[in-house]
């Protein structure tokens, strides 16, 4: 891997759990300043594999609110606006990192957690098999 | 918002930056144990709006490797396997949290950062406008 030269101004790391436990500044830096705020706001409705967004809230998690996509149909919308069941609407999933309060209900102590979220849906052509 | 009763076993929070700076255990808990390992492995190729995955590596970030989707075509693949330019392949984007080493090159001090990643692509019907 890449060796990172250590900055002499780093905070002290004499914690017995180091490097498993680190200090994290929650003052979020947002790198998305130039992104279009509308970026995918209507794709969920206009896609050939449209989806609904469901709010998932958990006060023990940071961020506490995550939006989950659920495909509206099994099939995809064709040129006539009908569902074509020979195609599949499938969720595009991504593993993301969240912070889980640990011990529970603690305001300043967390553990990293990996969760799988459905971000949206895409239309795929299945390979058809005929079985005995 | 929801008030969380404080756990008396919480770590000390006398830090002058509290609650902006918190302790985070990097020993990741993975909640995805029951997910299908094949889940979206070939959707990128079989979608009507296929995409390529590009590796984005940054040793100052955690996770250091993030995969970015780039749609292969402007249009979508039709039933004949040709690109239909009356439809649009568009990226589905999601804001995710990552940890940025701060100060730089420090192994045990981070700041939360929000970045926008393209997870995959979907096919949308554009709204057509004819202008003078």
């Amino acid at each position: 891997g890449i060796t990172i030269p250590r900055n002499p101004g780093c905070p002290n790391s004499e914690d017995k759990n180091f490097p498993r436990t680190v200090m994290v500044n929650l003052n979020i830096h947002n790198r998305n300043t130039n992104t279009n705020p509308k970026r995918s706001s209507d794709y969920y409705n206009r896609s050939t594999s449209p989806w609904n967004l469901h709010r998932n809230e958990d006060p023990e998690r940071y961020p506490s609110v995550i939006w989950e996509a659920k495909c509206r149909h099994l099939g995809c919308i064709n040129a006539d606006g009908n569902v074509d069941y020979h195609m599949n609407s499938v969720p595009i999933q991504q593993e993301i990192l969240v912070l889980r309060r640990e011990p529970p209900h603690c305001p300043n102590s967390f553990r990293l957690e990996k969760i799988l979220v459905s971000v949206g849906c895409t239309c795929v052509t299945p390979i058809v098999h005929h079985v005995a | 918002g929801i008030t969380i009763p404080r756990n008396p076993g919480c770590p000390n929070s006398e830090d002058k930056n509290f609650p902006r700076t918190v302790m985070v255990n990097l020993n990741i808990h993975n909640r995805n144990t029951n997910t299908n390992p094949k889940r979206s492995s070939d959707y990128y190729n079989r979608s009507t709006s296929p995409w390529n995955l590009h590796r984005n590596e940054d040793p100052e970030r955690y996770p250091s490797v993030i995969w970015e989707a780039k749609c292969r075509h402007l249009g979508c693949i039709n039933a004949d396997g040709n690109v239909d330019y009356h439809m649009n392949s568009v990226p589905i984007q999601q804001e995710i949290l990552v940890l940025r080493r701060e100060p730089p090159h420090c192994p045990n001090s981070f700041r939360l950062e929000k970045i926008l990643v393209s997870v995959g692509c979907t096919c949308v019907t554009p709204i057509v406008h004819h202008v003078a």
């Epitope: 659920k70 099994l74 599949n88 499938v90 795929v124 390979i127 | 299908n36 094949k38 070939d42 959707y43």
Partner: nanobody, 116 residues
Framework: QVQLVESGGGFVQAGGSLKLSCSVS????????MGWFRQPPGKGREFVAG????????FYGDSVRGRFTISGDNAKHTLYLQMNSLKPDDTAVYYC?????????YGQGTLVTVSS
């Protein structure tokens, strides 16, 4: 490999009922959704009903909605299609299917004939 075996087809009078079963075995952990298609004589295959594995949502083709009901028994690895108020237009070979998103598996089919 996936195995699908349909049963329950047969001859029925218009207005009658039938219940189709599909026994599923093999590598089914990849399931996204499963259900039934049908192919009327001399026509293409059309969607009848489906059930999404992740949340149990059910979906129906326009021509059967309100008359047919899809259900499943996880313990028995069996999929069912309860067909009520049958019409001559429902005459077809009914195929059970299982779908991973990327791959779709169809069984051999069972014939349903509805006489007027």
């Amino acid at each position: 490999q996936v195995q699908l075996v349909e049963s329950g087809g047969g001859f029925v009078q218009a207005g009658g009922s039938l219940k189709l079963s599909c026994s599923v075995s093999g590598n089914t952990f990849i399931t996204n959704h499963m259900g039934w298609f049908r192919q009327p004589p001399g026509k293409g295959r059309e969607f009848v009903a489906g059930i999404r594995w992740s949340d149990g949502s059910t979906f129906y083709g326009d021509s059967v909605r309100g008359r047919f009901t899809i259900s499943g028994d996880n313990a028995k690895h069996t999929l069912y299609l309860q067909m009520n108020s049958l019409k001559p237009d429902d005459t077809a070979v009914y195929y059970c299917y299982i779908d991973s998103g990327s791959d779709r598996y169809y069984g051999q089919g069972t014939l349903v004939t509805v006489s007027s």
